[in-house]
């Protein structure tokens, strides 16, 4: 007789999740010599321990604390790039501008990027059928709590000028309900962070509007200013050219506005 299993609204754990996390850890430690001391089996055990045998709607930041300790890493606090709804371009940027870091350029972010995971209460099984959806089921699920935890700590670590890449093609360029809007913005430390600089990425070829005047950007400016952090904003009209100029800044065409 098949055992009854809770049916959640979200997709189940990514197939081959344990193997993927372990392989990513090994790859990361090979690419980053300063992390070669990391024991990837211990990392996987700590990751697994955060959600296995626990109700997937009752996960806490504390559950991830053993993993956080193993993911200890140096991140230059003045080289942090946050992003919202424009992950691919942010990652392309840090792949070229190697001294800047998104959360997914850290070990912990790299391990979990684009993955889904959850377990079941009182069993050691991973649930590959379904996992809780943040809206339809519960917010304290393994994936949401993980990203809230690491995003908060990443923002807390930032200093000096912090950059954020925002998607100018969306109706809400700044979305208060995004991870950036609900977690990172509120955990920047005013005594450490002087300025938040927003880069609004344009989608259309002929889009010459000043999206820094968008009402949601003004809302972001208001939130940031109330926290005693300065705010600045730049339009990135041509993201393709922007990336090209990051690669080749001496190119003559890179002196004009991008």
């Amino acid at each position: 007789v098949p055992r009854w299993r809770q049916q959640w609204s979200g997709p189940g754990t990514t197939k081959r999740f344990p193997e993927t996390v372990l392989a990513r850890c090994v790859k990361y430690t090979e690419i980053h010599p300063e992390m070669r001391h990391v024991d990837c089996q211990s990392v996987w055990d700590a990751f697994k321990g955060a959600f296995i045998s626990k109700h997937p709607c009752n996960i806490t930041e504390e559950d991830y604390q053993p993993l956080m300790k193993l993911g200890t890493q140096t991140v230059p606090c003045n080289k942090i790039l946050l992003w919202s709804r424009i992950k691919d371009l942010a990652h392309q940027f840090t792949q070229v501008q190697r001294d800047m870091f998104t959360l997914e350029d850290t070990l912990l972010g790299y391990l979990a990027d684009d993955l889904t995971w959850c377990g079941e209460f009182n069993t050691s099984k991973i649930n590959y059928q379904s996992c809780p959806d943040w809206r339809k089921d519960c917010s304290n699920n393994p994936v949401s709590v993980f990203w809230k935890t690491v995003s908060r700590r990443f923002a807390e670590a930032a200093c000096d000028v912090v950059h954020v890449m925002l998607n100018g093609s969306r109706s809400k360029i700044f979305d208060k309900n995004s991870t950036f809007g609900s977690v990172e913005v509120h955990n920047l430390q005013p005594e450490k962070v002087q300025t938040l600089e927003a880069w609004v990425i344009h989608g259309g070829r002929e889009d010459s509007r000043d999206l820094c005047q968008d009402p949601t950007i003004k809302e972001l400016e208001s939130i940031i200013s109330k926290r005693n952090i300065q705010f600045s904003c730049k339009n990135i009209y041509r993201p393709d050219k922007f990336l090209q100029c990051v690669k080749n800044p001496e190119d003559s065409s890179c002196t004009s506005e991008i």
Epitope: T74, V75, N78, T106, R153, E156, K192
Partner: nanobody, 117 residues
Framework: EVQVLESGGGLVQPGGSLRLSCAAS????????MSWVRQAPGKGLEWVSS????????DYADSVRGRFTISRDNSNNTLYLQMNSLRAEDTAVYYC??????????RGQGTLVTVSS
């Protein structure tokens, strides 16, 4: 600007003790959790211990639990690490940093602890 200055390191025999200090400035010290992290020669960064702003919450790495004690004096903006029963594997440069990690950007030069007979 956050600034820290670590001191108190030195050469000590196995089983010996040291007390590290970290003088902090440029921020409201009592508002911030603080941590000690260390880097052994040729190794990566290892988290050692953290303490909340009020000192109500304290945590240690398993490798130092029972031997090291973290404390703070908010009136003097100073963080401490009392290290007892030192072992050769505790040899490292010790840094203090704001926050509880896992992401650290230590601002000080660190203080070298060498445990050797």
């Amino acid at each position: 600007e956050v600034q820290v200055l670590e001191s108190g390191g030195g050469l000590v025999q196995p089983g010996g003790s040291l007390r590290l200090s970290c003088a902090a400035s440029g921020f409201t010290f009592s508002n911030y959790a603080m941590s000690w992290v260390r880097q052994a020669p040729g190794k990566g960064l290892e988290w050692v211990s953290s303490i909340s702003g009020s000192a109500g919450s304290i945590d240690y790495a398993d490798s130092v639990r029972g031997r090291f004690t973290i404390s703070r004096d908010n009136s003097n903006n100073t963080l401490y690490l009392q290290m007892n029963s030192l072992r050769a594997e505790d040899t490292a440069v010790y840094y203090c940093a704001d926050g509880t990690g896992p992401f650290f950007d230590y601002r000080g030069q660190g203080t070298l602890v060498t445990v050797s007979s």
